[in-house]
């Protein structure tokens, strides 16, 4: 038995920040689990980890230097990534492991989300032109 994961196909981080919601075919209420977000086609970089425990506060951390936070829903974990760089544009995969109570469950690999990080514009945007010359 595998948990199914749904993610948005693509997200654009205009302000170098993005909310990526991982929706699971499994209710996480009163479970102990480890949800994580991985970067790259080979999922080589573990961007952010959320440990959920029925009796404790959510633990959120990154061992790879990402600025991240996490929010828990009954059947979802939302990762909030900040201070992203343009060169961190990539595909990101949600992963979930439910440890307790047994049995252990993990997910089928999802399709992933392409996060496109737009750089901060140094020149005025066409929608908000600067003061016009007289």
């Amino acid at each position: 038995n595998k948990i199914l994961v749904k993610q948005s196909p693509m997200l654009v981080a205009y302000d170098n920040a993005v909310n990526l919601s991982c929706k699971y075919s499994y209710n996480l209420f009163s479970r102990e689990f480890r949800a994580s977000l991985h970067k790259g086609l080979d999922s080589a970089v573990e961007v952010c980890v959320v440990y959920g425990n029925y009796s404790q506060q959510l633990q959120v951390y990154s061992k790879t230097g990402f600025n991240c936070d996490g929010k828990l829903g009954n059947e979802s974990v939302t990762f909030y990534l900040q201070n992203l760089y343009v060169n961190q544009t990539d595909i990101y995969f949600c992963k979930i492991e439910v440890m307790y109570p047994p049995p252990y469950l993990d997910n089928e690999k999802s399709n992933g989300t392409i996060i496109h990080v737009k750089g901060k514009h140094l020149c005025p945007s066409p929608l908000f032109p600067g003061p016009s010359k007289p």
């Epitope: 102990e32 492991e97 440890m99 307790y100 109570p101 047994p102 049995p103 252990y104």
Partner: antibody, heavy 120, light 111 residues
Framework: EVQLVESGGGLVQPGGSLRLSCAAS??????????VSWIRQAPGKGLEWIGE???????YYSPSLKSRVTISRDNSKNTLYLQLNSLRAEDTAVYYC????????????WGQGTLVTVSS | DIQLTQSPSSLSASVGDRVTITCRAS??????????LHWYQQKPGKAPKLLIY???SLQSGVPSRFSGSGSGTDFTLTISSLQPEDFATYYC?????????FGQGTKVEIK
């Protein structure tokens, strides 16, 4: 045949560190369906669970030891490791690795254990 | 953490006796109809050996004189006819929640 063999025990100074190994054979540490825990037993006392590692490499630790313990593995050697820091006399124990199945999490195979003595 | 309390802590019995050991959990260890409570036997200088898993299932190779019962918070290990090789210490263990915990043990001695 499934086998677990611990090594690395011995005399350690208080405040020091230990690194124990658990060589697994008869199954792969990286194959889904089984994980391995470390469990210890102080002389004349009961069994205490230290932590575990899943096939994915994810780890879970006892809250009372979490700040001092790291469980890792080397897939190429099919070997599990236990690192315990800031050792004190009460860490003196026989340390076991034990395999568990993913359905019931019962420990179906155990190593023979390795004795760690923390003393100056 | 889930506390497991075994009783008695020790007992003296003779070969052929029926022996019963109980294990009480501080909260239910049941989930979807399964009790995540297991029993182990340990002899001096040896590693523990799994006897019963999921409260009542006999581990492969374990003699049928060993049986387990119970659900929720109250569990029992029974040895129907004690044999010389059964003199040992018995532990219950829960795997319902982390951290996994063990009972303090019950030592079965020769009368």
């Amino acid at each position: 045949e499934v086998q677990l063999v611990e090594s690395g025990g011995g005399l350690v100074q208080p405040g020091g560190s230990l690194r124990l190994s658990c060589a697994a054979s008869g199954f792969s540490l990286s194959t889904s369906g089984v994980g391995v825990s470390w469990i210890r037993q102080a002389p004349g006392k009961g069994l205490e669970w230290i932590g575990e590692i899943y096939h994915s490499g994810s780890t879970y630790y006892s809250p009372s030891l979490k700040s001092r313990v790291t469980i890792s593995r080397d897939n190429s050697k099919n070997t599990l490791y236990l690192q315990l820091n800031s050792l004190r006399a009460e860490d003196t124990a026989v340390y076991y690795c034990a395999r568990y199945g993913y359905y019931y999490y019962d420990f179906d195979y155990w190593g023979q254990g390795t004795l760690v003595t923390v003393s100056s | 953490d889930i506390q497991l309390t075994q009783s008695p802590s020790s007992l003296s019995a003779s070969v052929g006796d029926r022996v019963t050991i109980t294990c009480r959990a501080s909260q239910s260890v049941d989930f979807h109809g399964i009790s995540f409570l297991h029993w182990y036997q340990q002899k001096p200088g040896k590693a523990p050996k799994l006897l019963i898993y999921a409260a009542s299932s006999l581990q492969s190779g374990v003699p049928s004189r060993f049986s387990g019962s119970g659900s929720g918070t109250d569990f029992t290990l029974t040895i129907s006819s004690l044999q010389p090789e059964d003199f040992a210490t018995y532990y219950c263990q829960q795997s319902y929640r982390s951290p996994r915990t063990f009972g303090q043990g019950t030592k079965v001695e020769i009368k």
